[in-house]
C-alpha cells in the first residue's frame, strides 16, 4: 500500500495491535519512545483484537487497507508527491 | 505524513461514539460483516479503556504522527 510508505511507523503499530503480537507492539512503541502508561493503553486496544479472534483482525485490517488505498488517501499521496517535487526543484 | 482519512478513522475509534465510528467505516466498506466487526471492536475499546487510557493512546498517536518515521 502506497500510504504505508508515507508513515511506516503508524502501520507498524497498527498491524502489531491488530495481529495481537505483544512483542511486536513493544518494539514498535519503543521506536516512538512510548511511556509505560501509553504502552498499557495500546495493549488494551490489542486485547480487543485478540479476544475477537482472527476474523476480527482480518476484517479490521481490510478496513485500514481500504481507507489507506482509497481515493481520499491516494489523492493526498499524489498531492504530497507533487509538493515534494516542487520543493526539491525550487531547492536546487 | 499520515493520510487525514486514516487519522480521522483512528480518532473516531478512540473518541467517537460507536455510531460515529461505524458510519465512518461504512464510507469505505459497506459489508455488513465488516461493520458489525467495527462496532464490536469499538464497544470493546470503550468498555476496556478509561478516559486516561484513551488520552494515553492519543498521546502515542501524536508521537507517531510527529516521528521522523512518519
Amino acid at each position: 500500500v502506497k500510504m504505508a510508505e508515507t508513515c511506516p511507523i503508524f502501520y507498524d503499530v497498527f498491524f502489531a495491535v491488530a495481529n495481537g503480537n505483544e512483542l511486536l507492539l513493544d518494539l514498535s512503541l519503543t521506536k516512538v519512545n512510548a511511556t509505560e502508561p501509553e504502552r498499557t493503553a495500546m495493549k488494551k486496544i490489542q486485547d480487543c483484537y485478540v479476544e475477537n479472534g482472527l476474523i476480527s483482525r482480518v476484517l479490521d485490517g481490510l478496513v485500514m487497507t481500504t481507507i489507506s488505498s482509497s481515493k481520499d488517501c491516494m489523492g493526498e499521496a499524489v498531492q504530497n508527491t507533487v509538493e515534494d517535487l516542487k520543493l526539491n526543484t525550487l531547492g536546487r | 505524513e499520515i493520510c487525514p482519512a486514516v487519522k480521522r478513522d483512528v480518532d473516531l475509534f478512540l473518541t467517537g461514539t460507536p455510531d460515529e465510528y461505524v458510519e465512518q467505516v461504512a464510507q469505505y466498506k459497506a459489508l455488513p460483516v465488516v461493520l458489525e466487526n467495527a462496532r464490536i471492536l469499538k464497544n470493546c475499546v470503550d468498555a476496556k479503556m478509561t478516559e486516561e487510557d484513551k488520552e494515553n493512546a492519543l498521546s502515542v498517536l501524536d508521537k507517531i504522527y510527529t516521528s521522523p518515521l512518519c
Epitope: 481515493k71 | 459497506a30 455488513p32
Partner: antibody, heavy 125, light 107 residues
Framework: QVQLVESGGGVVLPGRSLRLSCAAS????????MYWVRQAPGKGLEWVAV????????FYGDSVKGRFTISRDNSKNTLYLQMNSLRAEDTAVYYC??????????????????WGQGTMVTVSS | DIQMTQSPSSLSASVGDRVTITCRAS??????LAWFQQKPGKAPKSLIY???SLQTGVPSQFSGSGSGTDFTLTISSLQPEDFATYYC?????????FGPGTKVDIK
Amino acid sequence: QVQLVESGGGVVLPGRSLRLSCAASGFTFSSYLMYWVRQAPGKGLEWVAVIWYDGSNKFYGDSVKGRFTISRDNSKNTLYLQMNSLRAEDTAVYYCARDNGNSGYEDSWNAFDIWGQGTMVTVSS
Amino acid sequence: DIQMTQSPSSLSASVGDRVTITCRASQDIYNYLAWFQQKPGKAPKSLIYAASSLQTGVPSQFSGSGSGTDFTLTISSLQPEDFATYYCQQYNNYPFTFGPGTKVDIK
C-alpha cells in the same frame, strides 16, 4: 411467495411529515437487511436508507440524512420510513427492497433481490 | 460519494441483437456492482449482483462482467420483453449510488 407491499404514500404539504410502511411476507423478515429506494418522476433510482436485521445499524443517503428515519418491527414483519421536513424534491415513488444475502461472508451481501411495487409520495403546496 | 456513469444513455436495437451496456465507477468498487431492469410504471427487477452473478430466475441471455471500475451488462440475444431501462448500482460503500440508466428501445 416472497412479497413486499408498501403503503402510506400520498400528497403532503412541504415541511410536513409522513410515515411509509412496507409489509413483508413469505420469508424470515428478521434475518434480512432492508432498504428504501426512491425514484422521482421521470428520473433515475436513488438509494435512501438501510437498516440491519435487529435495527442496530442504520445508514442514510446524503439528501435525507437528519430528516428521514428508517425503522422496523420484526414482530410485525414491517419496515418503516418516517419522513419529516418534507421538501418538493422528496416527491417520488418509494420502494422497499430486501437484501440478497442473509448468512456467510458472500459477495451477495448488500445487493437487493426483492422489491415492492412502490408507493407515491407527492410534496406540494 | 462514488459516482456511477453509464453509456450509452439510450440505444435502439432489434429482437435478436446482442446489446452491451457499460458502467463506470469513479473509484474502485471491487466486484460490488448490481444491475437492474425497469419497465415504465413498474418496480425495478434485480438481474445481476457481484458484477457477474445472475439473480435466481433471470434468463441466461443476461450476463455481467468487470471488476474495479469498469463493468459491462450484455444481453446476448435481445427478446421483446427486454426493452426497458437498465441501471447499475455500486454497493461497496455507503451511500450506495446508481448509474443514470440506459434506455433500450425498439429500432
